[in-house]
Interface confidence: low
């Protein structure tokens, strides 16, 4: 079978910037690298029939199915799909290979099926069977990772009921603070569920899938660290897993540690110790509190009692629902043109928030910091100094909360005219917003020093601009002023600036813009 | 700022071969579709083809099949739309139109239109 | 080639008025489907894209739905400014035809 030509199939994902429908044979896409989908021959068919691997599109990918044929000569060919045939335009790449596309934009239900390619080429036809279905994202899920003690040892568990099935991952961290950032130095990541190592300072387990990422950050009370101004909180939904560690470093062994809720110690079975030797000798014993499912009566202070350490608490609270706590009336900003300054919410919320800053339809990602009093805080900062409406959107599983902001930056005004055969009328966008004069040029008055009073209407914030008000001057057009130059002003504390307009007939106008400071 | 800039209106005999050019900026030339449509005096808006302009892959609508073709300048963000074979009722304005996302969505950004005449 | 089909080819309407303009489809475009405004001597302008999503920068009066072979392109409350011709274009597959056209004239 020497002289059947050789066949690569291959799939191309675009990226997808959520923007494109329907389908087409005739161009590809900008695309990203191709992946081979095999295209062996398939075995007990009449003719030859090559068959790809089959291919799972996510709704709304776009995609590029692509032959390439390595014969000699010109070929011809036809796709069929669901009994309709489509236009086929081969080209030729440079290996001189020829090149069939089918480009489906944004897959949909009705664009999932068998593709058949017909080729034809002067030695041989054949046909080539693609076969695109829809992967099932409806049932995709991404939850947060929670904890179970490994049964019989002393290991924790990391748990993502999530679909597909996810990654875990620990990430742990022996330093205090800013040091634990994701991509410093003093992180370590393990790729596994398990985890035997429950002496570091910071331990958080991380699940990932197609859908993204989520992190669970074990709850620790620190008794060598100088305890927070304010107690630290935990907040739990009815039913999830509560886990609290409890850290002591000491000299020697000769202490122990205890767990109290509400000054009763907690029943046997809720709580599990695990002691080592540092390298400097020094004894850390760590004692974990848990309850597999909380209930509305596991609220209260969960105190951790040393014999060696002064005693800790955590305020836990059991919620029937998720929350976001912040003060949501809109505040407005004053700034000077080159000040130095930004937009901050504060805000308590369970579980952890998703946010957007939005400004002028464009949304910036969102950063969020824990405070020391259980707070968390977002600030934007990139705002360039353009003034205007700007959005910070949280939600969570079962709360949303928006706030709006809006920004002045005091300038002084800049003027824009424009006439027409009746009036004259002049715009300016300064802060604080200005107030209007208008002045007629004549022989007697060459410095424009006569003020115009009568006909004159100005009207303040005329249009809003993603919440940056224009304000506006129109002068009607009388017979004393016709054929004159006019000027209008514009003046706030900041300055003032002026048009010149040439009051003549209809058409285009000369202006002449003077800046006053 | 993001824009299409056509070339001059064109007047032309019948039989003879037009060439109309399209020059992007203010975006990343080749990240988008670039459509041809062209309207007759009073007449609607009938669709002429389409080219890619990372690849220079094209597709024509019928009508204009071997008539028509397509071709883009990647170094000078330019593409360009070549009649021939004119006849007076190719008197048309010619619009290029930038395709949104790749082409499933339309065009959001046009071109002012050449106008090309046919007349002996 | 997929066939559209817009109607009324004209309307005369008043500032104020909500007016609705169809586009049919002669088979199937799930949602594939523009619509444009034109004004005399200009370029067409993108209002509404994939059926119903509106362009930035355009005006909330406008509205757009529908979905397979049957659209609507509608206007809240019409100002001044929206006197124009408006035209439907399916982006199902090439060639991407266009509606005949819809004029909205000032009654």
């Known amino acids: 079978n020497q002289d059947l030509p050789v066949i690569k199939c291959v799939l191309i994902n675009h990226k997808n910037n959520d923007s494109s429908v329907g389908k087409s044979s005739s161009y590809p896409m900008v695309s990203e690298s191709p992946e081979d989908l095999g295209c062996a021959l398939r075995p007990q068919s009449s003719g030859t029939v090559y068959e790809a691997a089959a291919v799972e599109v996510d709704v709304s990918a776009s995609i590029t199915l692509q032959v390439l044929v390595d014969a000699p000569g010109n070929i011809s060919c036809l796709w069929v799909f669901k009994h309709s045939s489509l236009n086929c335009q081969p080209h030729f790449d440079l290996q001189n290979r020829g090149v069939v596309s089918m480009v489906i934009l944004k897959m949909t239900e009705t664009q999932a099926g068998e593709y058949l390619l017909f080729i034809q080429s002067e030695a041989t036809n054949y046909t080539i069977l693609f076969t695109v279905s829809i992967r099932n994202t409806l049932l995709y899920t991404l939850r947060r990772p929670y904890f179970r003690k490994m049964e019989n040892q002393d290991a924790l568990v990391c748990i993502s009921e999530s679909v597909p099935e996810p990654i875990v991952e620990w990430v742990l961290c022996d330093s205090q603070g800013e040091s634990c950032k994701e991509e410093s130095p003093a992180v370590v990541k393990k790729e596994e569920k398990v985890l035997h190592e429950l002496f570091g300072t910071d331990i958080r387990c991380c699940a990932r899938n197609e859908l993204g990422r989520e992190c669970t950050r074990l709850f620790t009370i620190d008794l060598n660290q100088t305890p927070q101004t304010t107690l630290p909180q935990l907040f739990l939904k009815v039913g999830e897993p509560l886990w609290i560690r409890c850290k002591a470093v000491h000299v020697n062994h000769g202490f122990g540690l205890t767990w109290e809720l509400e000054n009763k110690a907690l029943e046997e079975g809720n709580y599990f110790e695990m002691s080592t030797y540092s390298t400097n000798r020094t004894m850390i014993r760590i004692l974990f509190a848990f309850v597999s499912s909380v209930a509305r009566n596991d609220t209260g202070y969960y105190t951790c009692s040393s014999s060696k350490h002064p005693s800790q608490s955590a305020l836990v609270t059991i919620v029937e629902k998720g929350f976001i706590n912040a003060t949501n009336s809109s505040e407005d900003y004053e700034i000077d043109q080159y000040e130095e300054f930004c937009f901050s919410v504060r805000f308590k919320a369970y579980p952890q928030i998703r946010c957007t800053w939005t400004f002028s339809r464009k949304s910036f990602p969102c950063e969020q910091k824990g405070l020391d009093n259980g707070y968390s805080i977002s600030k934007f900062c990139n705002h360039k100094h353009q003034p205007g409406e700007y959005i910070f959107h949280a939600e969570n599983d079962d709360a949303q909360f928006t706030k709006m902001f809006t920004l002045n930056i005091r300038r002084k005004p800049q003027v824009l005219a424009e006439a027409s055969a009746s009036q004259a009328s002049c715009f300016s966008d300064g802060y604080p917003l200005p107030s209007w004069t208008w002045k007629k040029c004549s022989d007697k008055s060459p410095n424009c020093t006569e003020e115009i009073t009568e006909g004159v209407w100005n009207r303040k914030a005329n249009r809003k601009v993603f919440g940056q008000w224009v304000s506006s001057s129109t002068l009607n057009m009388s017979e004393a002023i016709k054929g004159f130059l006019v000027k209008c002003c514009a003046y706030n504390s900041l300055g003032t600036s002026c048009e010149t307009i040439l009051l003549n007939s209809p058409g285009p106008f000369p202006f002449i813009q003077d800046n006053i400071s | 700022q993001v824009q299409l800039v056509q070339s001059g209106a064109e007047v032309k005999k019948p039989g003879a071969s037009v060439k109309v050019s399209c020059k992007a900026s203010?975006?990343?030339?080749?990240?988008?579709?670039m459509h041809w449509v062209r309207q007759a005096p009073g007449q609607g808006l009938e669709w002429m083809g389409i080219?890619?302009?990372?690849?220079?892959?094209?597709s024509y609508a019928q009508k204009f099949q071997g008539r028509v073709t397509m071709t883009r300048d990647t170094s000078t963000s330019t593409v360009y739309m070549e009649l021939s074979s004119l006849r007076s009722e190719d008197t048309a304005v010619y619009y290029c139109?930038?395709?949104?996302?790749?082409?499933?969505?339309?065009?959001?950004?046009w071109g002012r239109g050449t106008l090309v005449t046919v007349s002996s | 080639d997929i066939q559209m089909t817009q109607s009324p080819s004209s309307l005369s309407a008043s500032v104020g008025d909500r007016v609705t303009i169809t586009c049919r489809a002669s088979?199937?475009?799930?949602?594939?489907l523009a619509w444009y405004q034109q004004k005399p001597g200009k370029a067409p302008k993108l209002l509404i894209y994939?059926?119903?999503s509106l362009q930035s920068g355009v005006p909330s009066r406008f509205s757009g739905s529908g979905s397979g072979t049957d659209f609507t392109l509608t206007i809240s409350s019409l100002q001044p400014e929206d006197f124009a011709t408006y035209y439907c274009?399916?982006?199902?597959?090439?060639?991407?035809?266009f509606g005949q056209g819809t004029k909205l004239e000032i009654k």
């Open positions: 139109a930038r395709g949104v996302g790749y082409s499933g969505y339309g065009a959001d950004l």
């Open positions: 203010g975006y990343t030339f080749t990240n988008y579709y």
């Open positions: 080219i890619n302009p990372s690849g220079g892959s094209t």
């Open positions: 088979q199937g475009i799930s949602n594939s």
């Open positions: 994939a059926a119903s």
């Open positions: 274009q399916q982006s199902h597959s090439p060639p991407y035809t």
